[in-house]
């Protein structure tokens, strides 16, 4: 004869564990039903009654089978710098990711807490390291013999064209100007682009650079405290 199927709640055999989607309630000392995703335990089980589950309220969720007394709060609404790639439902948290042309400056377990715009290197500077989804563009001054005349998050410094006779010497932000119509060697027309994992920023959202100059130095900092805790107010 097949073994009799036990219905929750039931006392487990000594040394055995509760079945899938069940949990052991320490107080009742019984195997009891878990609540399904999108629900939480409204009333815990006893020796004679099983777990009573209830649906998560608006702006809260549970993603797994559980026996939590309250559903988890969905994260804050996505900021204007972000795109909601997963909505807050009873079974899943909201996920915010950065919009094109921005990178994740502060990540969280899923998605991004703070997006910032990819830096645009100004004329005289080229991209030394392209931006990624999680790191900003690094700019460097154009070395002698190279230039960049654009404000761009993708353009690198390009070599000056080589002239038979130079009319105007090139500098870090301008190509050389030749007197003859055909220089001996010139780069292909147009800016040189680095591979760009993040799309370039749309015109209406790009920050306004204020050019000036300062010496370039850098050193690493130790990690400091975390930013303020994320709000859990939903829609």
């Amino acid at each position: 004869l097949p073994a009799q199927v036990a219905f929750t709640p039931y006392a487990p055999e000594p040394g055995s564990t509760c079945r899938l989607r069940e949990y052991y309630d320490q107080t009742a000392q019984m195997c009891c039903s878990k609540c399904s995703p999108g629900q939480h335990a409204k009333v815990f089980c006893t020796k004679t009654s099983d777990t009573v589950c209830d649906s998560c309220e608006d702006s809260t969720y549970t993603q797994l089978w559980n026996w939590v007394p309250e559903c988890l709060s969905c994260g804050s609404r996505c900021s204007s710098d972000q795109v909601e790639t997963q909505a807050c439902t009873r079974e899943q948290n909201r996920i915010c990711t950065c919009r094109p042309g921005w990178y994740c400056a502060l990540s969280k377990q899923e998605g991004c807490r703070l997006c910032a715009p990819l830096r645009k290197c100004r004329p005289g500077f080229g991209v030394a390291r392209p931006g990624t989804e999680t790191s900003d563009v690094v700019c460097k001054p154009c070395a002698p013999g190279t230039f960049s005349n654009t404000t761009s998050s993708t353009d690198i410094c390009r070599p000056h064209q080589i002239c038979n006779v130079v009319a105007i010497p090139g500098n870090a932000s301008m190509d050389a100007v030749c007197t003859s119509t055909s220089p001996t060697r010139s780069m292909a027309p147009g800016a040189v682009h680095l591979p760009q994992p993040v799309s370039t920023r749309s015109q209406h959202t790009q920050p306004t650079p204020e050019p000036s100059t300062a010496p370039s130095t850098s050193f690493l900092l130790p990690m400091g405290p975390s930013p303020p805790a994320e709000g859990s107010t939903g829609d």
Partner: nanobody
Framework: DVQLVESGGGLVHPGGSLRLSCAAS????????ATWARQPPGKGLEWIST????????TYADSVKGRFIISRDIAKNTVYLQMNNLKPEDTGMYVC?????????????????WGQGTQVTVSS
């Protein structure tokens, strides 16, 4: 101890001004990018402005362009956010960060040092 401390927040009427300060201790702010962000009530963190250490370039979010000015005083190891013509939608917790250029290779997805924030409320 490496830390940033923001101050200067408060309650102000629409059209008013505030000057936020972000004082660094335990490290030199002069070699780092400085960023201000804010968290409006019930919303996520929003980027406001960045001042790049190497070129002193300043960038601003469209929502604050022409009203906010980021600056720094290297001698005082402090970064400022001058906020003019404030609007109710500027209400929120303002935090500043210091990051080394281009982010850390070890922790590329995180800003380096964060302050705890200063509350700004714009209301009539």
């Amino acid at each position: 101890d490496v830390q940033l401390v923001e101050s200067g927040g408060g309650l102000v009427h629409p059209g008013g001004s505030l000057r936020l300060s972000c004082a660094a201790s335990g490290f030199t702010f002069s070699a780092d990018d400085a960023t201000w962000a804010r968290q409006p009530p019930g919303k996520g963190l929003e980027w406001i402005s960045t001042l790049y250490f190497d070129t002193e370039e300043k960038t601003y979010a469209d929502s604050v362009k022409g009203r906010f000015i980021i600056s720094r005083d290297i001698a005082k190891n402090t970064v400022y956010l001058q906020m003019n013509n404030l609007k109710p939608e500027d209400t929120g917790m303002y935090v500043c960060t210091a990051t080394w250029a281009g982010g850390s290779l070890l922790r590329p997805a995180s800003f380096g040092v964060w302050g705890q924030g200063t509350q700004v409320t714009v209301s009539s």
